[in-house]
């Protein structure tokens, strides 16, 4: 009888998740990404904050930088120079936008164990990086780029026209940072550090968004950001390259823009160095269905960069916009001219292609009714990539190796059978020449990071297995999760359902739809998470569902591009269709259905609530877009075209939340926004509120003073507590 008695006592000690667990991050997990510094070595910050160098082949490790040194300047980050002579230490981190921040940098000399004195770096610095070889430094200070041949040398100033909110050198402006580059930097060293390429963004003519930052002073501050909304004037971008060996000799040389791009408004989308004397630039028309990849060569005789038309490769979409969320970037082959790139095949699935002379002659490397998602590394004999091919689940990610050093190329799934139940969603990080690699598994089980041999794929060791988390979860009643699909009118709607621990199909449960639904997004993923919705299922007995409808990614262009020029229609329809299907399953209380979303999800949840279906009792919109005329040009126009009469103004007007104000009369609506949201401006919610007041529709609202789009810090606790009360009230659940 003992085993069953133990089992019973275990049952009794099991507890539900609490909101406090979620807000305290009690069940957060760790990942391990090696900071590779060679084919067989990586750096890692140990638990006691020493910076340790590990050599995989010798099995040895040693501390290259002590926690004492880190602490002496309050360093929160570090960067080792490639020649291993210096380390930069980063402190006084001050966040700006999503990726950008400023910091103070100190250079520590490993050879003598002292900080470099003399010619210290100015502060605060906007971006700093080592050259890929040696220990040259490039940095951006007050929107200008500086170069140091050695850390102790005086700086050489490369640009002089940098001006706050006007001219940005080596760093992106707001819209390029958020919507195009997805980085805090806009400068790129050539592979051996001979050249430095950089972007200059001229925001002089861009309209400015201004909002109050209340702070603690008598008068609020006004934050001004050049922010092009749909149809507005855009930044003017130019790309320059300077020879860092003799920077004063000819100075920065501008890289020419392809003629077919320069003929109208355009964007620069990415830069990839191929060799020290060959660079690849990607450009995009403002109407983002044409992208041009241009390969440019250094002309020694003229000291200029030549981009022959024969080395221009055009990628055009006839059914939507170019690429997925962004246009993919090339991964060059060893011949330094041909490359691998992901783009749509003739069947409308994103796959890896090999391009040599022309895109028309591209050789398709992967194919099938699934999508290649990322090319990690190309070596002389292997290409490593991720896809969602395995077992036809779009929300999974496995790592594959294609042998390209022999014919026919053979494909092997590296991860599919490693920890099949625990791990179905991977990413990878490769050392030089793919000698070794780390696999990071995000779920659906507890995340685990492992180290592997790049030739044999053998697991060498576990880098992080989240044992503490595993132990902490042993007495927690976690909700059940299932990922399934609905087939509706030739559309496949994948969904994730989070069910209460003691779920009983014969009972009725309140349903909460969590929606994002933005173009090229994916919510239904086989990943581990213990978050707010886990708590709602575990403790409050709700069923939560996430549905990937039209416009979402990795299931082919038909689904992805269905929303082209029609945002706010099919995304909403598909959430509603799914809800109807869930009701048919028999365990949903159709009088207690809610929907909530954040950002794009707030837009969709608002439109769903105002759809007039009578399906939803209540809903929440956090930081929603309310009109596409209020959002950033780069993002909005990609999917919607221009808000002009001869383009797509009509749908811009038809797709606003405000136009549906009347329909909110029969739902309980909670509208939430941060007043210092630099991304989706408070203006969006202000206009919804105004329209609801004008229509005399009651609603609830919460603003978060001086909070941005992330509603972080104490606001997070307040937000989730407030939303919990709202939902419990809506679902008549006792507090």
């Amino acid at each position: 009888l003992r085993p069953s008695r133990v089992h019973n006592s275990e049952e009794n000690t099991m507890r539900a998740l609490t909101l406090k667990d979620i807000l305290n991050g009690t069940f957060s997990y760790k990942t391990f990404f090696p900071n590779w510094i060679s084919g067989q070595e990586y750096l890692h910050q140990s638990a006691d904050n020493n910076i340790v160098l590990y050599n995989i082949e010798t099995g040895q490790s040693y501390t290259i930088l002590s926690n004492r040194t880190m602490k002496s300047v309050n360093a929160s980050n570090y960067g080792l120079s490639p020649d291993r002579q210096f380390v930069y230490l980063e402190s006084d981190y001050s966040k700006l936008w999503r990726y950008s921040y400023t910091a103070t940098y100190y250079i520590y000399d490993l050879s003598n164990g002292e900080f470099v004195r003399g010619n210290e770096l100015p502060r605060p610095i906007q971006y700093l990086c080592w050259s890929p070889v040696g220990s040259k430094l490039a940095y951006v200070y007050q929107n200008n780029i500086y170069l140091k041949q050695r850390p102790g040398d005086p700086p050489f100033q490369i640009t002089f026209n940098g001006r706050e909110n006007k001219i940005f050198n080596g760093i992106p402006d707001w819209v390029y940072e958020e919507e195009m580059l997805a980085t805090k930097y806009a400068l790129w060293w050539s592979p051996n550090g001979k050249f430095l390429a950089y972007a200059e963004f001229n925001d002089t003519d861009i309209p400015v968004i201004a909002y109050s930052y209340y702070g603690d002073e008598q008068y609020p501050r006004t934050i001004n950001i050049p922010y092009p909304k749909a149809g507005a004037k855009n930044p003017v971008v130019r790309i320059f390259i300077i020879d860092t060996t003799y920077p004063a000799y000819v100075g920065p040389q501008e890289v020419p823009v392809p003629a077919m791009i320069a003929s109208s408004d355009y964007y620069f989308s990415w830069l990839t160095w191929v060799t020290d004397e060959r660079v690849c630039l990607q450009w995009l028309k403002r109407v983002q269905n044409v992208s041009v990849l241009s390969i440019c060569d250094f002309r020694e005789d003229w000291q200029t960069w030549d981009c022959p038309k024969t080395q221009e490769h055009i990628e055009e979409s006839r059914t939507g916009w170019a690429g997925g969320f962004f246009v993919s970037t090339p991964v060059f082959s060893y011949d330094a001219i041909s490359y691998y790139k992901i783009f749509s095949d003739k069947d409308g699935y994103k796959h890896i292609h090999y391009i040599k002379d022309t895109v028309e002659n591209a050789i398709q490397i992967t194919s099938g009714k699934w999508e290649a998602i990322n090319i990690f590394r190309v070596t002389q004999d292997s290409l490593f990539y991720s896809s969602n091919e395995f077992e036809e689940y779009p929300g999974r990610r496995n790592i594959y190796r294609i042998s390209i050093g022999s014919y026919p190329p053979s494909k092997k799934c590296v991860t599919c059978h490693l920890r099949k139940e625990r791990c179905q969603y991977y990413t990878a990080s490769f050392s030089d020449y793919a000698k070794y690699y780390a696999l990071v598994c995000y779920g659906p089980g507890i995340p685990i990071s492992t180290l592997h041999d790049g030739r044999t794929d053998q697991e060498i060791k576990i880098l992080e297995e989240n044992k503490e988390l595993e132990n902490a979860l042993k007495n927690i009643q976690l909700p059940k999760e299932e990922i399934k699909k609905l087939e509706v009118d030739e559309i496949t709607l994948w969904y994730k359902m989070i069910l209460p621990p003691q779920f009983d199909r014969s009972k009725k449960y309140p349903l909460l739809i969590q929606v994002y639904g933005g173009p090229c997004s994916q919510s239904v993923r086989s990943v581990f998470a213990v978050n707010w919705i886990s708590y709602l299922a575990s403790k409050e007995g709700m069923v939560i569902a996430l549905v990937d409808g039209r416009g979402t990614a990795f299931q082919g262009d038909k689904l992805l591009y269905a929303v082209y020029r029609k945002l706010g229609v099919y995304e909403v329809e598909d959430q509603i269709t799914a809800v109807r299907k869930f009701i048919e399953m028999g365990f949903i209380d159709e009088k207690r259905i809610a929907i909530w979303g954040w950002s794009y999800g707030g837009y969709v949840s608002s439109l769903a609530l105002a759809s007039g279906t009578g399906l939803f009792k209540c809903g929440i919109a956090v930081a929603p877009v309310s009109s596409w005329e209020y959002y950033a040009s780069v993002y909005t126009e990609r999917f919607m075209g221009l808000p002009t009469k001869d383009d797509n103004l009509e749908h811009y007007k038809n797709s606003t939340v405000m136009a549906r104000a009347e329909y909110f009369r029969n739902v309980d609506y909670l509208l939430i926004h941060g007043t210092a949201d630099d991304n989706v401006h408070f203006q969006n919610s202000a206009q919804i509120a105004k329209a609801l007041v004008n229509a005399q529709v009651d609603f609830q609202a919460m603003w978060y003073s001086d909070q941005n789009h992330g509603l972080s810090g104490l606001s997070t606790n307040h937000l989730y507590t407030h939303m919990t009360h709202f939902l419990k009230q809506c679902f008549s659940l006792s507090d």
Epitope: Q311, S333, D335, S338, K356, N361, I363, I404, Y407, P408
Partner: antibody, heavy 122, light 106 residues
């Protein structure tokens, strides 16, 4: 030992047709790209076209695209060149050639047959 | 792409070093092969990727070049080296040959 043996050459009248064959042995024919090359008497080499291992890609020199058809039968280890609408200037020694896969994604012509002669004359 | 080979012919003695050049009308990015053809025989691959020697080719042969200009160098000519030499690009179809260089014994 690798062998490529062309056959099917001979005398053909202008405007006529002819089908050349190339029998392969000594290597895994089904994994090789194959090409046809011709050489007019006393002249240089002229590339006619190529075919990939599974016949999904066939490329021709533009001037011959509409009159020559390259095909293969991997089960028979044989490469074909169907010639139509021939003219006197098509008189040449016709070689088939095959070769190793070269990284990245192209093929050299490592192996050549001894050639078969086609004479176009009335 | 047009491949221009020079010289069309040259005579040299055993033991000498000769260089044959090949110019492409556009960059072919090292996608170049060299062949040797002896009288009445089929061509034979000597060099690919502009500078890699094919299996069994003596080390006195060497290929070089980049962009549009390529050359084949034969050091210390041997009696068996006399014949015709052709370059061929593999950059984009059609994979054209150069006009050939006839190397004769002096």
């Amino acid at each position: 030992e690798v062998q490529l043996l062309e056959s099917g050459g001979g005398l053909v009248q202008p405007g006529g047709s002819l089908k050349l064959s190339c029998a392969a042995s000594g290597f895994d024919f089904s994994t090789y790209w194959m090409s046809w090359v011709r050489q007019a008497p006393g002249k240089g080499l002229e590339w006619i076209g190529e075919i990939n291992p599974d016949s999904s890609t066939i490329n021709y020199t533009p001037s011959l695209k509409d009159k020559f058809i390259i095909s293969r039968d991997n089960a028979k280890n044989t490469l074909y060149l169907q010639m139509t609408k021939v003219r006197p200037e098509d008189t040449a020694l016709y070689y088939c050639a095959g070769g190793y896969y070269r990284y990245p994604y192209y093929y050299t012509m490592d192996y050549w047959g001894q050639g078969t002669t086609v004479t176009v004359s009335s | 792409l047009v491949m221009t080979q020079s010289p069309a012919s040259l005579s040299a003695s055993v033991g000498e070093t000769v260089t044959i050049t090949c110019r492409a009308s556009g960059s072919i990015h090292n996608y170049l092969a060299w062949y040797q053809q002896k009288q009445g025989k089929s061509p034979q691959l000597l060099v690919y990727n502009a500078k890699t020697l094919a299996d069994g080719v003596p080390s006195r042969f060497s290929g070089s070049g980049s962009g549009t200009q390529y050359s084949l160098k034969i050091n210390s000519l041997q009696p068996e080296d006399f014949g015709s030499y052709y370059c061929q690009h593999f950059w984009s179809t059609p994979y054209t040959f150069g006009g050939g260089t006839k190397l004769e014994i002096k």
